[in-house]
């Protein structure tokens, strides 16, 4: 059977700019071209998203950090661990769009 | 000072297939012309999203509901709750993708 | 989780002004109204008027134009309510809550705050 | 401004009741109708919004219901946890609460 109706206040505080986990795919040319292949092929990062309440805001973040993360990098004959650095938003705000 | 380094096992396993949190815009065309304004204009639901260990496989989902959710319809002279289903993906799985 | 942690009680003369903030934490500030809402004892609830971090707008209940000045401060989310010319009729519990965008509906409340005005 | 009207300013109960509290808007207000329960000395605690949406983490035996200018909250099997104020609102035009509460005692 079909669940119960999510509550709007719910759906509300949900759907609204914060920071939230979005996947990042992985670029090769980052790496050069000794490497054959990243894994993962994607990363999970935090970043500002969702909705503002009115159309004339848009979702931006005021608090960012770099996240270090272990990626492995197979390359032939020998494959090793790499580190890649990427943007994670802590804080958002639903600010006026620019003209 | 800069965080630590996300290990790579932390790093694979975020990353990979499986059901996660993404926002999805609202169409104000579902709602007919007499609605102004949606709110909030987006939601969340639960999708199947992440990378697979392989290029030829593709992240699906092999489970999924409707989910009911409560949203404000901005009409004139009232508002009102009105309800939308959307597909929630609740298992998901690395396949070969489709030639 | 979401918290409206409000400043403590205040004991003022009458003719003077007063400031009680109200500090948010664990959700987007921007993203919810601000409300202001007074309790005097032993009686209803009377809204004073909300203020939107996002755009700054404000809107007062007419019968206290004047009285209340709401403000915040996004980088802090911090809300403000600023009471001036104070008289006995001021005192009361004020309470600042918050809700969505367009339906007035408050779902997190501060503690209240305690305003006495005496000579 | 709308004026919303709470007749009943006591209501007696007992433990295991239904009791049904009741709010008449001086004008049509659609379906923009919140109830709230307060305890001494406490914040007031969102129950039900517009008119029939029972808030996260509420109770079922809290039902509202209603439409235009006549709300009703009800309580079945009522807990001496229930024993409170209950306020009611409309955000229809700008916001007024009840002119009052209804206050819930046992009999």
């Known amino acids: 059977h079909q669940k119960k109706v999510v509550p709007w206040i719910d759906v509300y505080a949900r759907a609204t700019c914060q920071p939230r986990e979005v996947v990042v795919p992985l670029s090769m040319e980052l790496m050069g071209n000794v490497v054959k292949q990243l894994v993962p092929s994607c990363v999970t990062v935090q970043r500002c998203g969702g909705c503002c309440p009115d159309d004339g805001l848009e979702c931006v973040p005021t608090g960012q950090h770099q996240v270090r993360m272990q990626i492995l990098m197979i390359q032939y004959p020998s494959s090793q661990l790499g580190e890649m650095s990427l943007e994670e938003h802590s804080q958002c705000e639903c600010r006026p769009k620019k003209k | 000072h800069q965080k630590k380094v996300v290990p790579w096992i932390d790093v694979y396993a975020r990353a990979t297939c499986q059901p996660r949190e993404v926002v999805v815009p609202l169409s104000m065309e579902l709602m007919g012309n007499v609605v102004k304004q949606l709110v909030p204009s987006c939601v969340t639901v639960q999708r199947c999203g992440g990378c697979c260990p392989d290029d030829g496989l593709e992240c699906v989902p092999t489970g999924q509901h409707q989910v009911r959710m409560q949203i404000l319809m901005i009409q004139y002279p009232s508002s009102q709750l009105g309800e939308m289903s959307l597909e929630e993906h609740s298992q998901c799985e690395c396949r070969p993708k489709k030639k | 989780q979401v918290q409206l942690q409000q400043s403590g009680p205040e004991l003022v003369k009458p003719g003077t002004s007063v400031r009680i903030s109200c500090k948010a934490s664990?959700?987007?500030?921007?993203?919810?109204?601000i409300h202001w809402v007074k309790q005097r004892p032993g009686q209803g609830l009377e809204w004073i008027g909300w203020?939107?971090?996002?755009?700054?707008?404000?809107n007062y209940n007419e019968k206290l134009k004047g009285k209340a000045t709401l403000t915040a401060d996004k980088s802090s989310s911090a809300a403000y309510l600023q009471l001036n010319s104070l008289t006995s009729e001021d005192s009361a519990v004020y309470f600042c809550?918050?809700?969505?965008?367009?339906?007035?509906?408050?779902?997190?409340w501060g503690q209240g705050t305690t305003l006495t005005v005496s000579s | 401004d709308i004026v919303m009207t709470q007749s009943h300013k006591f209501m007696s109960t007992s433990v295991g009741d239904r009791v049904s509290i009741t709010c008449k808007a001086s004008?049509?207000?659609?379906?923009?109708v919140a109830w709230y329960q307060q305890k001494p000395g406490q914040s007031p605690k969102l129950l039900i919004y517009w008119a029939s949406t029972r808030h996260t983490g509420v109770p079922d035996r809290f039902t509202g219901s209603g439409s235009g200018t006549d709300f009703t909250l009800t309580i079945s099997n009522v807990q001496s946890e229930d024993l409170a104020d209950y306020f009611c609102?409309?955000?229809?035009?700008?916001?007024?609460f009840g002119a009052g509460a209804t206050k819930l005692e046992l009999k």
């Open positions: 203020f939107y971090p996002g755009n700054v707008n404000t």
């Open positions: 004008q049509d207000v659609g379906t923009a």
């Open positions: 664990g959700y987007t500030f921007t993203t919810f109204y």
């Open positions: 609102q409309q955000y229809s035009s700008s916001l007024t």
């Open positions: 809550t918050r809700s969505p965008y367009y339906g007035y509906v408050f779902d997190y």
